[in-house]
Amino acid sequence: VPPGEDSKDVAAPHRQPLTSSERIDKQIRYILDGISALRKETCNKSNMCESSKEALAENNLNLPKMAEKDGCFQSGFNEETCLVKIITGLLEFEVYLEYLQNRFESSEEQARAVQMSTKVLIQFLQKKAKNLDAITTPDPTTNASLLTKLQAQNQWLQDMTTHLILRSFKEFLQSSLRALRQM
């Protein structure tokens, strides 16, 4: 089991095994660090991070987002509904993470690592939600055609899509982290 950590997140040489919730928390923070590394390359490479034309591109994307009805916010918090939303959202993000795989020159391995670490996070959460049957898996055919569509965009739109995926994924994970800490 990954080691425990102190408040500074330093690898303590002597540790107790982490609880299931601590492991999930740590895994999400690990992925968030990976997203930060990828965002650095995206923002250095283009001016997308300051662009005001995001709304235009965002309309073409159906990126998972937390809403009031999902029960993940402090007001109207619902553990079961929220957990289903987190897992469903992560499963929906997988096609977008696949799209990112060919979008980075110097950070190719980082993009792969974010994708694989997310697969592990999904495994952790599916165990936590093993009694919940309301989790729908995205249709592979729909995902395949979405991927083809995204890859056929012009360069500017592909850069914007990359930026939006990373930003949305970061926001989704941050919301998930806050919600999971209440569970």
């Epitope: 089991v1 990954p2 080691p3 950590e5 997140d9 330093v10 690898a11 303590a12 040489p13 540790r15 095994p17 299931s20 740590k26 895994q27 923070r29 690990y30 992925i31 660090d33 990976g34 930060s36 590394a37 980082q110 690592a113 694989m116 670490s117 592990v120 165990k127």
Partner: antibody, heavy 116, light 107 residues
């Protein structure tokens, strides 16, 4: 004296199955997570998956997910790796290791060859 | 297999030399890094954990340093039994990943 001893390796055809065992001795087996790690001939190390001390939680690397299953019998101090739908690229030496995030004790390894 | 950058991939050195191997993590991993030594036909052996803590029984000529993304394994005075392949491993998150390895050969 800590000891981990793997067994069950051998030659298997593509699509076949194999179960590896890892017998532990010298430490409180149920108190530790355990991992399986493999090394293809002449290549580096690759983590396969992990099982918690109680056996209640498992997690796998993406390339074996759905094909490999890790289990343990704490009454027998034994760890298992059930490998199904084996492929040529699964050919490797398979190690079991005590898992505290890093791997402080390893078995000697058992060779699995997937070939027709 | 996702791999971190470990360098060099191989090096030639003489007994008594000071040897330094570096490992760069894909992103910030605090000090969740371990180093292993592996000899041909044998299982890896843990040398260093938590970036700089020496595993018990490991000679004091081995030392580790670094945090964040950049890490170093140093052998202060190379001994005949130290000719082997060395791997780094991150355990900040799953899947655990290893460096590609550095083979230390006799000059």
């Amino acid at each position: 004296y800590y000891q981990l001893v793997e067994s069950g390796g051998g030659l298997v055809q593509p699509g076949g199955s194999l179960r590896l065992s890892c017998a532990a001795d010298g430490f409180l087996f149920s108190g530790y997570a355990m991992s399986w790690i493999r090394q293809a001939p002449g290549k580096g190390l690759e983590w396969i998956g992990q099982i918690s001390g109680s056996g209640g939680s498992t997690v796998y690397n993406y390339n074996v997910l759905g094909r490999f299953t890790i289990s343990r019998d704490n009454s027998k101090n034994t760890l298992y790796l059930q490998m199904n739908s084996l492929r040529a690229e699964d050919t490797a030496v398979y190690y079991c290791a005590r898992d505290t995030g890093y791997f402080d004790h390893w078995g000697q390894g058992t060779l699995v060859t997937v070939s027709s | 297999n996702i791999q971190k950058t470990q360098s060099p991939s191989s090096l030639s050195a003489s007994v008594g030399d000071r040897v330094t191997i570096t490992c760069r993590a894909l992103w910030h991993i605090s000090s969740y890094l371990a180093w292993y030594q592996q000899k041909p036909g044998k299982a890896p052996k843990l040398l260093i954990y938590a970036a700089s803590h020496l595993h018990y029984g490991v000679p004091s000529r081995f030392s580790g340093s670094g945090s964040g993304t950049d890490f170093t394994l140093t052998i202060s005075s190379l001994q005949p039994e130290d000719f082997a392949t060395y791997y780094c491993q991150q355990y900040s998150g799953l899947p655990y990943t290893f460096g590609q390895g550095t083979k230390v050969e006799i000059k």
